[in-house]
């Protein structure tokens, strides 16, 4: 018998439930007690190197001492039994680790899946953390045969893949056992035919074929997974345009039975589409396959579905009897062009007579016209055919435009510049909106857009900049020509001015001074100037502020002190804040004009 260890602790390897009580006993060997001249009264208990208070000890007899813990909350406690020898020297007798945790909870939500070509995998929810090594075992049996247990791996404790091959059309019973040092529990049993748990492989070799006859259809073909020989399939077919992020879905009832092709209808002409497909058991019992690899296809072209937006400008400097007219139009967006636009056809008819034809590759055409009334038509052409014609009346030289839009307003909203108006009583064919940036440094180069005659509110479709002043013009277009234009200024987003106004004196008297200033150039305004504030003070006095309406360019300061130096500056304000101009000084005279000391 060895004197070392000098005793032992019982239990040797305890695993206890969290928040429970626990008692350990240290029993000294008689020979050790004899050698060190000690008994159980000399035992000192320690946890993690800290001495446990004596109140927790119980001396059982001369060889044994126990210690009790209540409500254990630590997961690991190093417990040592020590003896006080040779006066106060501490000698370690024995040590154990108290491991605490919780018994396993009943595993829940047990479900199984048979991935085509693979063995059955089941997974479950293990419940709360036990803090202990807990083994999960998947058990399975037929009515007549028990299968080998499937022990979940440590790193994947909530799933297990069985070792045996799947047999379809025979019911199997499956359950999970969870066991650790504190207990063993069993999940509810589930009973099923594995055929209802199949996840097929995705269809493969997906390809897309277009139709030259119909520009709105594409035919998909694919190869079904081999599980098709065991089960009937249904499909989910999704598609999107190449640049879109959201998918559209074919109605499920159209793809609810086994097939290897499908024709997708109601597509846009000359558009690239992306397709994907997945499948599952026809009756919906089981799992959808993963998506197939995506396949792309382009629908065939169709004639342009809309006439281009069409407008004109007349050069103001025209020769006697003639005028230069620039016809202009917008390229059709792809969803209206329905193919590659090859060219445009323009016709000009002078008052029921002479017809001129032009084929143009550009989006403008400059022509010399007499002062008569003309009707212009424009069509866009692609491989398949022509668009409907856009018709424009260019009135005679002496035409008087009337009937403008009313109540024209422009305002920013949601990072766009909106324009709205009240429609005239007369029947409007369309509206032309023109806009340009007002600047002292550059001419107003207009962009434009066309709106349908029924519209009375729209936003400007262009790359608009913040803190720029836009001049927006709305022209109604009638059957006999354009109406009167109406214009309005607007900002997409205002900012404080970049510079403040420069103030100067127009006239200085003994007790008053007339100040004047110039309107800020439009390039530095950055918004609508709503008002000015004039700040003035003497060297020793308080500053006085005066608000002035933005329409003024001069203001008289009164009640000034004679023979005094004044400092004055001025701020201009938009809806987004103000900016000070430079400070200016002036001195009031000692005497009024003609006054003698």
């Amino acid at each position: 018998e060895l004197l070392d260890p000098c005793g032992y602790i019982s239990p040797e390897s305890p695993v206890v439930q969290l928040h429970s009580n626990f008692t350990a006993v240290c029993v000294l060997k008689e020979k050790c007690m004899d050698y060190f001249h000690v008994n159980a009264n000399y035992i000192v208990w320690k946890t993690n190197h800290f001495t446990i208070p004596k109140e927790q000890y119980t001396i059982i007899n001369r060889t044994a001492s126990s210690v009790t813990f209540t409500d254990i909350s630590s997961l690991n406690i190093q417990l040592t039994c020590n003896i006080l020898t040779f006066g106060q020297l501490e000698q370690n007798v024995y040590g154990i680790t108290i491991i605490s945790g919780l018994p396993p909870e009943k595993p829940k939500n047990l479900s199984c899946i048979v991935n085509e070509g693979k063995k059955m995998r089941c997974e479950w929810n293990r419940g709360r953390e036990t803090h202990l090594e807990t083994n999960f075992t998947l058990k399975s049996e037929w009515a007549t045969h028990k299968f080998a247990d499937c022990k979940a791996k440590r790193d994947t404790p909530t799933s297990c893949t069985v070792d045996y091959s799947t047999v379809y059309f025979v019911n199997i019973e499956v359950w999970v056992e969870a066991e650790n040092a504190l207990g063993k529990v069993t999940s509810d049993h589930i009973n099923f035919d594995p055929v209802y748990k199949v996840k097929p492989n995705p269809p493969h070799n997906l390809s897309v074929i277009n139709s030259e006859e119909l520009s709105s259809i594409l035919k998909l073909t694919w190869t079904n997974p081999s599980i098709k020989s065991v089960i009937r399939l249904k499909y989910n077919i999704q598609y999107r345009t190449k640049d879109a992020s959201t998918w559209s879905q074919i109605p499920p009832e159209d793809t609810a039975s086994t097939r290897s092709s499908f024709t997708v209808q109601d597509l846009k002409p000359f558009t690239e589409y992306v397709f994907r497909i997945c499948c599952m058991k026809e009756d919906g019992k089981g799992y959808w396959s993963d998506w197939s690899e995506e396949a792309n296809g382009i629908t065939y072209e169709d004639r342009p579905s809309k006439a281009p937006s069409f407008w004109y400008k007349i050069d103001p400097s025209h020769a006697q009897g003639y005028r230069t007219v620039q016809l202009m139009w917008k390229t059709l967006p792809p969803f209206e062009a329905n193919g590659k636009i090859l060219d445009y056809e323009v016709t000009l008819t002078r008052w029921k007579s002479h017809l001129q034809n032009y084929t143009v590759n550009d989006t403008k055409l400059t022509v010399n016209l007499t002062n008569d009334r003309y009707v212009a038509t424009l069509t866009a052409r692609n491989l398949v055919g022509k668009s409907d014609a856009a018709v424009l009346t260019i009135p005679a030289c002496d035409f008087q435009a009337t009937h403008p839009v009313m109540d024209l307003k422009a305002f920013p909203k949601d990072n766009m510049l909106w324009v709205e108006w009240t429609t005239p009583r007369e029947s409007v064919k369309k509206y032309i909106l023109e806009w340009c940036v007002l600047s002292d440094k550059a001419p107003c180069i207009a962009d434009w857009q066309q709106e349908d005659g029924t519209v009375h509110r729209t936003h400007l479709r262009g790359n608009l900049a913040e803190s720029k002043c836009y001049l927006i013009t709305v022209t109604p277009v009638y059957a006999d020509g354009p109406g009167s234009p109406e214009s309005i200024k607007a900002y997409l987003k205002q900012a404080p001015p970049s510079k403040g106004p420069t103030v100067r004196t127009k006239k200085v008297g003994k007790n008053e001074a007339v100040l004047e200033w110039d309107q800020l150039p439009v390039d530095v305004q950055n918004g609508f100037i709503r008002n000015y504030t004039i700040f003035y003070r003497t060297i020793i006095g308080n500053e006085t502020a005066v608000n002035v309406d933005s329409s003024h360019t001069e203001y008289t300061l009164s009640s000034l002190t004679s023979d005094t130096l004044y400092m004055v500056r001025m701020a201009a304000y938009t809806d987004e804040g103000g900016k000070d101009g430079p400070e200016f000084t002036f001195t009031t005279p000692k005497f009024a004009q003609g006054e003698i000391e």
């Epitope: 004197l3 070392d4 020979k31 004899d34 050698y35 020898t85």
Partner: antibody, heavy 115, light 108 residues
């Protein structure tokens, strides 16, 4: 102070038995055991065994198993060692010592085995 | 059984000398080693227990060290009354408790 007082010298014939006593004082007799050690003339020390005065548990050296008996009498705080079937090579001074630490020794008892 | 081997078996030294006696165990005995002094015709006397603890009443010139298998007894400055035989003894494995064969310390 702690004292261990042993019985006097003995002369024995081969085959006889001898019983040596060891009376303890100056401490609680039952708190510690008694060890027995012998020393043949001109030789080193040889451990014979140990007895717990509290429980009566004992350990004998293999060499003496079956020939030696160690006992205690707690009422008189005395320990005894009896050696049987004496041989001439059992001639030695027999010591009792306190505990397995041998911190206090008796004065020794000379046992002579001679025909 | 655990064998205890002392060295040297005997040595001569003078008063005031520093003397070291070693004891080797045939296997580890942790710190369960005692040293005894025995003078002729007398019972042995405990000097050191548990390898390095000085028994009460023993002069401080005696000291012990070591653990496992190798141990030493040191007398820092030899006194006339220190000439005797010294024994080491293990209590780690019992039975049996075993002694070294002894080291005789003589006057030079």
């Amino acid at each position: 102070q702690v004292q261990l007082v042993q019985s006097g010298a003995e002369v024995k014939k081969p085959g006889a038995s001898v019983k040596v006593s060891c009376k303890a004082s100056g401490y609680t007799f039952t708190s510690l055991g008694i060890s027995w050690v012998r020393q043949a003339p001109g030789q080193g020390l040889e451990w014979m065994g140990w007895i717990s005065a509290y429980s009566g548990n004992r350990d004998y050296a293999q060499k003496f198993q079956g020939r030696v008996t160690m006992t205690t009498d707690t009422s008189t705080s005395t320990a005894y060692m009896e050696l049987r079937s004496l041989r001439s090579d059992d001639t030695a001074v027999y010591y009792c010592a306190r505990s397995l630490r041998f911190d206090y020794w008796g004065q020794g008892t000379l046992v002579t085995v001679s025909s | 059984d655990i064998q205890m081997t002392q060295s040297p078996s005997s040595l001569s030294a003078s008063v005031g000398d520093r003397v070291t006696i070693t004891c080797r165990a045939s296997q580890s005995i942790s710190s369960y080693l005692n040293w005894y002094q025995q003078k002729p015709g007398k019972a042995p006397k405990l000097l050191i227990y548990a390898a390095s603890s000085l028994q009460s009443g023993v002069p401080s010139r005696f000291s012990g060290s070591g653990s496992g298998t190798d141990f030493t007894l040191t007398i820092s400055s030899l006194q006339p009354e220190d000439f005797a035989t010294y024994y080491c003894q293990q209590s780690y494995s019992t039975p049996p408790i075993t002694f070294g064969q002894g080291t005789r310390l003589e006057i030079k």
